[in-house]
C-alpha cells in the first residue's frame, strides 16, 4: 500500500471544506501550525486545525449524530404514531356505532322510553370513550348509572304508564329499588364484567402505543455528552486536520465509538424487547369478552334482554315496588301492560354484508408483526448508524481516530485512545436521566401488559364460565353472535366489520344524533379505506 499522502502544505483543502461548515476563514490557519492548544484532534505533527475549529467540529458532530438517530427511528416512529391514531379513531367509531345501535334498539322496540333513554345511552358511551382515553372513570359506576337511570323511566312509561307527572317524585325510590330488588337480574353484572374487561385491555393497548411514541421521541431527541462529541469529532473530522479529506473512518472503530456514545440508549433494549413481546401477548388475547369491538357492538342486545327480563317480572315487581315506594305516591296506579312494547318488531335487522375479512383484530396483528421487525432496534442502533454514515469497507486504508491505517485493530485503537479519554468510563456512567425515566415507564407498562395478558389457550374466562354469563355465546366458529338471541337482534358474521363506516339509516327522528351521527364522515371512510367495506345493518 502507498504511504499516506503528506498533509496539505497550505491547508487550502481544509479551508474550503471548513467554510462550508462555518462561513468565514478567520479560524483556519493558512499553513499547518503546531496545534498545541488542541484538545481532541491531538496532532502528531503540524495541523491545519485550531481550537475554534475543533469546537465547531464537535458541535457539528453532535448534530450529525442527532440527525442520524432521528432518521434511524423515523420508520418505527411513523409506524407507531400512525397506528395509535388509527386505533384511537377506530375505537371512537366503534363506540359511536354501539351508541347508534342502542339508540336504534330503543327507537324500534321502546319508543315510549325516548328521548330519556337516548340521554342515558349517550352518557354511558361518553363514559366509555373517556375511559378508553385514560380518564378517571369507574366502569361499575357507568353501568350502575345507566340502569339506575333507565329503571324509573321503564317503570313509569312501560310498567305503570298511568302514573301522573307528580309521581316522578318516586324516581329516587325506584333507583334504590333497582339495586335492592335486582330488577334487571344479572344483566348489569354481566355488562360490568364484559365492558370492564374489554375496555381495560383497549385502554392499556392505547396507553402502550402512546408510550411507544414517547420512548422513540425520548431517544430521538437525546443530547449527546461532550465525551461522545469528542469521540465523534475524532472519528469524523480529525482526519481533516491532517489534510486527509477523502479518508473514511474504519468500520470497527465506528462501532466502538457508537457503542460508547449509545451505551445508555442501548440499555433500553431489554425493556423494549419485553414491551413488544408483552404487547403481542396482549393482542393475542384481545378476543371475545376482551375485544371491545365484540362487546360494545353487542351491548344493545344485552340491554334489550335486560329490559325484557324486567317486563317478564313486571307483575311481581309492580306489586313489590308499589309497597316499597308507597310513601312516595299518594295512591296506587293501575299497572298497564302494552303489547307493542312487550313484543319485538319481527322485521329482522339485517346485518352487514362483509366483503373483506379485515377487522380491528387483524389490524392489531399486522401492527405486532411490523413491530416485531423492530424488536432489536435499540441493540442494533450503533451498527445501523455506522452503516448509514461513511465508513471504510473491510476496515482497510481507513481512519482509526489518530492516523490512516492499512488495517484497523481495535486493540491498537483502544491503546491510542487511553490518553485522550476513557471509553470504559463513558460506558460506566450509565444512562441519561431521561433514559432512566423512560426505562422506568417501560418497566411499568410491561408489568401492566403482563397482568392484562390472558393465559394462552384459554377459551372462556374462568369466572364468567362459572357464573354462566357466557352461556349464550355462539362458540368459536366463524358465525359468532353478539349478545342475546331475541327476534330483531343483529346476528353478526365474523363480527361487525364497521370499517369503513357503516352507512346508517336509523330513521331516528327525535334521537339525539339523528342525522348527524347516522351519516358517516368522509374522513373516517378514507382512514379505513383498506379495512373492509360494509353495508347498512339497520334498515
Amino acid at each position: 500500500q502507498p504511504p499516506p499522502p503528506p498533509p496539505d502544505a497550505t491547508c487550502h483543502q481544509v479551508r474550503s471544506f471548513f467554510q462550508r461548515l462555518q462561513p468565514g476563514l478567520k479560524w483556519v490557519p493558512e499553513t499547518p501550525v503546531p496545534g498545541s492548544d488542541l484538545q481532541v484532534c491531538l496532532p502528531k505533527g503540524p495541523t491545519c486545525c485550531s481550537r475554534k475549529m475543533e469546537e465547531k467540529y464537535q458541535l457539528t458532530a453532535r448534530l450529525n449524530m442527532e440527525q442520524l438517530l432521528q432518521s434511524a427511528s423515523m420508520e418505527l416512529k411513523f409506524l407507531i404514531i400512525q397506528n395509535a391514531a388509527v386505533f384511537q379513531e377506530a375505537f371512537e367509531i366503534v363506540v359511536r356505532h354501539a351508541k347508534n345501535y342502542t339508540n336504534a334498539m330503543f327507537k324500534n322496540n321502546y319508543p315510549s322510553l325516548t328521548p330519556q333513554a337516548f340521554e342515558f345511552v349517550g352518557e354511558f358511551f361518553t363514559d366509555v370513550s373517556l375511559y378508553i382515553l385514560g380518564s378517571d372513570i369507574n366502569v361499575d359506576d357507568m353501568v350502575n348509572e345507566l340502569f339506575d337511570s333507565l329503571f324509573p323511566v321503564i317503570y313509569t312509561q312501560l310498567m305503570n304508564p298511568g302514573l301522573p307527572d307528580s309521581a316522578l317524585d318516586i324516581n329516587e325510590c325506584l333507583r334504590g329499588a333497582r339495586r335492592d330488588l335486582k330488577v334487571f337480574g344479572n344483566f348489569p353484572k354481566l355488562i360490568m364484567t364484559q365492558v370492564s374487561k374489554s375496555l381495560q385491555v383497549t385502554r392499556i393497548f392505547l396507553q402502550a402505543l402512546n408510550l411507544g411514541i414517547e420512548v422513540i421521541n425520548t431517544t430521538d431527541h437525546l443530547k449527546f455528552s461532550k465525551d461522545c462529541g469528542r469521540m465523534l469529532t475524532r472519528m469524523w473530522y480529525c482526519s481533516y486536520c491532517q489534510g486527509l479529506m477523502m479518508v473514511k473512518p474504519c468500520g470497527g472503530y465506528c462501532n466502538v465509538v457508537m457503542q460508547g456514545c449509545m451505551a445508555g440508549v442501548v440499555e433500553i433494549d431489554k425493556y423494549w424487547r419485553e414491551y413488544i413481546l408483552s404487547l403481542e401477548e396482549l393482542v393475542n388475547g384481545m378476543y371475545r369478552i376482551y375485544d371491545m369491538e365484540n362487546v360494545l357492538l353487542g351491548l344493545f342486545s344485552t340491554i334489550h334482554d335486560s329490559i325484557q327480563y324486567v317486563q317478564k317480572n313486571a307483575g311481581k315487581l309492580t306489586t313489590t315496588i308499589g309497597k316499597l315506594c308507597a310513601h312516595s305516591q299518594q295512591r296506587q296506579y293501575r299497572s298497564a301492560y302494552y303489547p307493542e312494547d312487550l313484543f319485538i318488531d319481527k322485521k329482522v335487522l339485517k346485518v352487514a354484508h362483509v366483503e373483506h375479512e379485515e377487522t380491528l383484530s387483524s389490524r392489531r396483528r399486522e401492527l405486532i408483526q411490523k413491530l416485531k421487525s423492530f424488536i432489536s432496534f435499540y441493540s442494533a442502533l450503533p451498527g445501523y448508524i455506522c452503516s448509514h454514515s461513511p465508513v471504510a469497507e473491510n476496515d482497510t486504508l481507513c481512519w482509526n481516530g489518530q492516523e490512516l491505517v492499512e488495517r484497523y485493530s481495535q486493540k491498537a485503537a483502544r491503546n491510542g485512545m487511553k490518553n485522550q479519554f476513557n471509553l470504559h468510563e463513558l460506558k460506566m456512567k450509565g444512562p441519561e436521566p431521561v433514559v432512566s425515566q423512560i426505562i422506568d415507564k417501560l418497566k411499568h407498562i410491561n408489568q401492566l401488559l403482563r397482568t392484562m395478558s390472558m393465559p394462552k389457550g384459554r377459551v372462556l374466562d374462568k369466572n364468567l364460565d362459572e357464573e354462566g354469563f357466557e352461556s349464550g355465546d355462539c362458540g368459536d366458529d366463524e358465525d359468532e353472535c353478539i349478545g342475546g338471541s331475541g327476534d330483531g337482534m343483529i346476528k353478526v358474521k365474523n363480527q361487525l366489520r364497521f370499517l369503513a363506516e357503516l352507512a346508517y339509516d336509523l330513521d331516528v327522528d327525535d334521537a339525539p344524533g339523528n342525522s348527524q351521527q347516522a351519516t358517516p364522515k368522509d374522513n373516517e371512510i378514507s382512514t379505513f379505506h383498506n379495512l373492509g367495506n360494509v353495508h347498512s345493518p339497520l334498515k
Epitope: 370513550s129 359506576d141 348509572e145 329516587e172 339525539p512 344524533g513 339523528n514
Partner: antibody, heavy 116, light 110 residues
Framework: EVQLLESGGGLVQPGGSLRLSCAAS????????MSWVRQAPGKGLEWVSA????????YYADSVKGRFTISRDNSKNTLYLQMNSLRAEDTAVYYC?????????WGQGTMVTVSS | QSVLTQPPSASGTPGQRVTISCSGG????????VNWYQQLPGTAPKLLIY???QRPSGVPDRFSGSKSGTSASLAISGLQSEDEADYYC???????????FGGGTKLTVL
C-alpha cells in the same frame, strides 16, 4: 326537600388554594352524580367538575384540569372541591348541583375571589 | 365564548308569548337533549326544562321546550312579571365530553 348548602368560599391570592364544601340533604346522596358549576361576575354559567355517585369516576373542564380535585364523602353527604393554583379567572360564584348532564337542584352558591 | 348561541336579550309585555332560541352544532344539540335553566336576579339557577321538553314538577305549563336538529327553543306563553330573569340553554357536548351552556338571555317584561 332537596337542599344543597355550599361553604368555603372567600378571598385568596393568585396561586393559593381553597376547599369548597357542599352539604346535601333530602335525597339519597350516594345514588346521584354531583357537579360544581361556576358563574363569573356578570357572566354566564360554566360547568367545572362532576363526580359519580360512588366517587369512582371524576370529570373536569379543561380550564381546571390538574388544578381542581372533586371528591365526596357519602357517609357525611358532602361534596368537595379542592382548588389549587388559583388564578384571577377562577373568580366566580361556585354552585354545587345535583346531576352530571343536567342539574335538577342547585345550592345558593359560594363566592370565590382570587386577587392580590 | 359560549358553545351554544343565545340572543343576549328578549322582551315582551305581560300576557304575550316569547320565544328564546338556542343554536348549537352536531356534537352538542344535534346529538343530545337540551335543558333550560331560569336564574332570577340574585338567586341560583333553577331547572326549567329537561330532555328537550319535560317540565320538572312545580314548573308551570306556560313554559315549553322544543328541539329540532341543532337548534332548540324555549317558549313562554302568558308572560308574567315574575318571569323576568336570565334564561340559559344547556346540553352535553360529545366533542368536549362535558356539559355546555349558552351565554344566557336576559328576559325583560315590559
Amino acid at each position: 326537600e332537596v337542599q344543597l348548602l355550599e361553604s368555603g368560599g372567600g378571598l385568596v391570592q393568585p396561586g393559593g388554594s381553597l376547599r369548597l364544601s357542599c352539604a346535601a340533604s333530602g335525597f339519597t346522596f350516594s345514588s346521584y352524580a354531583m357537579s360544581w358549576v361556576r358563574q363569573a361576575p356578570g357572566k354566564g354559567l360554566e360547568w367545572v367538575s362532576a363526580i359519580s355517585g360512588s366517587g369512582g369516576s371524576t370529570y373536569y373542564a379543561d380550564s381546571v384540569k390538574g388544578r381542581f380535585t372533586i371528591s365526596r364523602d357519602n357517609s357525611k353527604n358532602t361534596l368537595y372541591l379542592q382548588m389549587n393554583s388559583l388564578r384571577a379567572e377562577d373568580t366566580a360564584v361556585y354552585y354545587c348541583a345535583k346531576g352530571k348532564r343536567y342539574f335538577d337542584y342547585w345550592g345558593q352558591g359560594t363566592m370565590v375571589t382570587v386577587s392580590s | 365564548q359560549s358553545v351554544l348561541t343565545q340572543p343576549p336579550s328578549a322582551s315582551g309585555t305581560p300576557g304575550q308569548r316569547v320565544t328564546i332560541s338556542c343554536s348549537g352544532g352536531s356534537s352538542d344539540i344535534g346529538s343530545n337533549t337540551v335543558n333550560w335553566y331560569q336564574q332570577l336576579p340574585g338567586t341560583a339557577p333553577k331547572l326549567l326544562i329537561y330532555y328537550n321538553n319535560q317540565r320538572p314538577s312545580g314548573v308551570p305549563d306556560r313554559f315549553s321546550g322544543s328541539k329540532s336538529g341543532t337548534s332548540a327553543s324555549l317558549a313562554i306563553s302568558g308572560l308574567q312579571s315574575e318571569d323576568e330573569a336570565d334564561y340559559y340553554c344547556a346540553t352535553w357536548d360529545d366533542r368536549m365530553y362535558s356539559p355546555v351552556f349558552g351565554g344566557g338571555t336576559k328576559l325583560t317584561v315590559l
